[in-house]
């Protein structure tokens, strides 16, 4: 932004500048250019020997200016365009200034003036241009400063040129008031802080309903000597409930919200929320719908799932495989997990209790993501009831639970308890036992064994007794051994797999249990 202190051309000849010597040299004249009257100060004493003609402006109040810019528009005639070349003719003039705290009026003293520069034209007006009224206008700009007094004068010294001053414009520069990144920067006088620091740092203030982001830098701009803003640092963001519209922050419309200070616009209230009011920072959930603590406010409100579908319990001796399908209503969420609980009842007494401690699950029964699980180590002649509950991220916000149950009766034998009776370098003697009450139901026992690490082959031995010797084994080798009762109903519960090791040929191996 340029703040003009003096504009000769704009004054339409009404500025009465002082000429020295009076009545000679510089002269105010009017001309017609582009069908418009223009005024100029002109001098053309090119054949009268040495010249020293001065033209002084009126006193100019400095205002806030520290450095002023002087823009001159002028024309200079070619000395060769005059007959005989006009031997005393010059093609330059001198620019001066003087500072003062008061207007000296018509009291003009050359010694008070300091030379700014010799002003020379880039283009001179040759005869053909003059004749054709082609004004070869030159534009020169000079900077003066720092100024310290209340005002100043400019003066133009003619030393024998044929020159016309068409425009004298004096101005200083300001960086204009500006809105940038939602920050308002005040109008700032363009000054160099120092030669090494040609930029003035200016702090901005956030516009209404805008804030400096948390942990961010406040808005700063740099005002150059040329009155231009440079290098913005930091920014302001529209606060929660407001969005950026051009250079302002506007409240979110009803039905929209914004939860934090950011560059993003207001978002439409998501599904299953109540319509928000103007300037909302969030949208409340409809009744029966919830938000998990980790859910973003932009996410739809959700509800707990319905119970799992089609729960089935398939008994396999002392094991049960539970299978189910996902709930029909997921509540609008993907984070569904399942938990399985177990209850056992004694048929004789009808007494029931939890059985988590006595059964084994194929994977932890809480926070299951798959839709099946195998439960083993079930006791025979026992009734089991399994409950599968579906949960999601908002289930914890309600007291009701969504589960389905399935019951199964176990007629299976208890798994045999196996131990190593004896061993040699090539044999293992294994014994086992089962409760007396179940022995009458066992038809035979099946012993399965294989070398540890060899998954491709195994051996099976059947016996009616409670022991077996496994021969033809390799020395110093670990074998995996399992015993399973065979009943009329099929396979009974299998023992756990035991690791037993034959003796080494040196006979120095330990017995493994």
């Amino acid at each position: 932004k340029e703040v003009v202190l003096l504009d000769f051309a704009a004054m339409k000849g009404e500025l009465g500048w002082l000429t020295h010597p009076y009545g000679k040299g510089w002269d105010l004249m009017q001309n017609i250019m582009d069908d418009m009257p223009i005024y100029m100060y002109s001098v053309c004493n090119v054949v009268s020997g040495d010249q020293d003609n001065w033209l002084r402006t009126n006193w100019v109040y400095r205002e806030e200016a520290e450095r002023i810019f002087i823009e001159l528009k002028f024309t200079v005639r070619d000395c060769n365009s005059f007959p005989g070349g006009a031997s005393s003719c010059k093609e330059t003039f001198n620019l001066y200034y003087a500072e003062s705290d008061v207007d000296y009026g018509t009291n003009f003293q050359k010694r008070q003036f300091t030379k700014i520069d010799t002003i020379a034209p880039d283009e001179i007006t040759v005869s053909s241009d003059f004749e054709a009224r082609n004004v070869k206008l030159n534009v020169e700009e000079r900077m003066v400063g720092p100024l310290t007094r209340k005002g100043f004068y400019l003066a133009f010294q003619d030393i024998g040129a044929c020159v016309a001053l068409l425009s004298v414009r004096v101005y200083y520069k300001k960086c204009p008031e500006m809105l940038q990144s939602l920050a308002r920067f005040p109008e700032t006088i363009a000054v160099a802080v120092s030669d090494t620091q040609p930029l003035a740092t200016v702090a901005g203030t956030c516009v209404d309903h805008a804030v400096v982001p948390y942990g961010g830098e406040g808005p700063l701009m740099h005002c150059t000597v040329d009155g231009e803003w440079l290098v913005p640092i930091g920014q302001c963001l529209c606060q929660e409930g407001y969005e950026k519209v051009e250079d302002a922050c506007r409240a979110c419309s009803p039905g929209f919200f914004k939860s934090e200070a950011s560059e993003s616009p207001c978002l439409e209230c998501p599904e299953h929320t109540l319509p928000s009011t103007e300037g909302a920072t969030s949208c409340q959930c409809e009744e029966g719908y919830f938000r998990a603590p980790e859910d973003p406010l932009s996410m739809s409100c959700t509800r707990p799932p319905s119970a799992p579908n089609y729960l089935t319990a398939i008994g396999m001796g002392a094991k049960v495989e539970l299978r189910w399908t996902a709930p029909k209503d997921t509540g609008g969420r993907q984070d569904i997990v399942y938990s399985v609980t177990c209850e056992q009842c004694w048929p004789e007494s009808g007494e029931c209790g939890p059985c988590e401690a006595s059964v084994r699950y194929s994977e932890p029964p809480h926070a299951l993501t798959r839709t099946s699980v195998t439960v083993s180590d079930l006791e025979p002649h026992m009734n089991y009831t399994f409950a599968v509950e579906a949960r999601n991220g908002v289930s914890g916000l309600v007291t009701s639970r969504s589960f389905r149950t399935a019951s199964v009766s176990i007629n299976q034998t208890e798994p045999p308890k196996v131990r190593l009776e004896d061993r040699s370098t090539t044999s293992l003697s294994v014994t086992w036992s089962i409760p007396v009450s179940q022995q009458s139901r066992v038809w035979k026992y099946e012993v399965t064994y294989r070398k540890k690490g060899d998954a491709n082959s195994y051996n099976v031995r059947r016996t009616e007794g409670f022991s077996v010797t496994l021969d033809d084994l390799a020395p110093d080798t670990t074998y995996l051994v399992q015993v399973q009762a065979l009943t009329q109903e099929g396979q009974g519960a299998g023992s756990k797999v035991h690791e037993f090791q034959t003796l080494s040929t040196e006979g120095s191996a330990n017995m493994a249990v």
Partner: antibody, heavy 128, light 107 residues
């Protein structure tokens, strides 16, 4: 020394035509703006027409516009005025005049010109 | 067109007198004014241009002044060779108009 010598004047009937010439010498003719100025018997001066140094632009007084044509031949150092549809009020002494910007000691040329050099004139009489 | 009015139309003066002729323009012409001298049967001669600039070879007893609409030609110390008719001419517009003339006669 600058010399301008008009010729071609004489008696002509109303509606008739005449061509005036102005022979120039003693200066660089192609640098000068040239003009015709007339003076009716016992009256003041009246500007008629002008032509630029290289043949343009041309200007005419309203009283002669459309009837008179100014031209020049720089190779012959001669200025012309072709006068058609002559009227009785065109009776006057016709002067050829010149202006050289080199003798105009001003920084910016005036909107038009004045006349630094004049010929002795030639009389044109329009009468039946 | 710009009208130029001279006054007086004629005047009688003696050798050595100071004579002033005025010229008024119907609208402002800045300083775009010339003065000419014409003797009977002769062509006009340029005296002054741009209101106050003396043409080459013109005696310094002739001077011009004024701007806008009011102009004057002054002969300080009239000489026998100065008895003639004087015309002003504006060249602020392309219609370069002359005043009607002022005749300076011997008293």
């Amino acid at each position: 020394e600058v010399q301008l010598l008009e010729s071609g004047g004489g008696l002509v009937q109303p509606g008739g035509s005449l061509r005036l010439s102005c022979a120039a010498s003693g200066f660089t003719f192609s640098h000068y703006m040239m003009a015709w100025v007339r003076q009716a018997p016992g009256k003041g001066l009246e500007w008629v027409s002008r032509i630029g140094p290289s043949g343009g632009p041309t200007h005419y007084a309203d009283s002669v516009k459309g009837r008179f044509t100014i031209s020049r031949d720089n190779s012959k150092n001669t200025l012309y005025l072709q006068m058609n549809s002559l009227r009785a009020e065109d009776t006057a002494v016709y002067y050829c005049a010149g202006y050289d910007s080199g003798y105009d000691y001003v920084a910016v040329a005036g909107p038009a010109e004045y006349f630094q050099h004049w010929g002795q004139g030639t009389l044109v009489t329009v009468s039946s | 067109d710009i009208q130029m009015t001279q006054s007086p139309s004629s005047l009688s003066a003696s050798v050595g007198d100071r004579v002033t002729i005025t010229c008024r323009a119907s609208q402002s012409i800045s300083t775009w004014l010339a003065w000419y001298q014409q003797k009977p049967g002769k062509a006009p001669k340029l005296l002054i241009y741009k209101a106050s600039n003396l043409h080459t070879g013109v005696p310094s007893r002739f001077s011009g002044s004024g701007s806008g609409t009011e102009f004057s030609l002054t002969i300080s110390g009239l000489q026998p060779d100065d008895f003639a008719t004087y015309y002003c001419q504006q060249y602020n517009s392309y219609s370069r108009t002359f005043g009607q003339g002022t005749k300076v006669e011997i008293k």
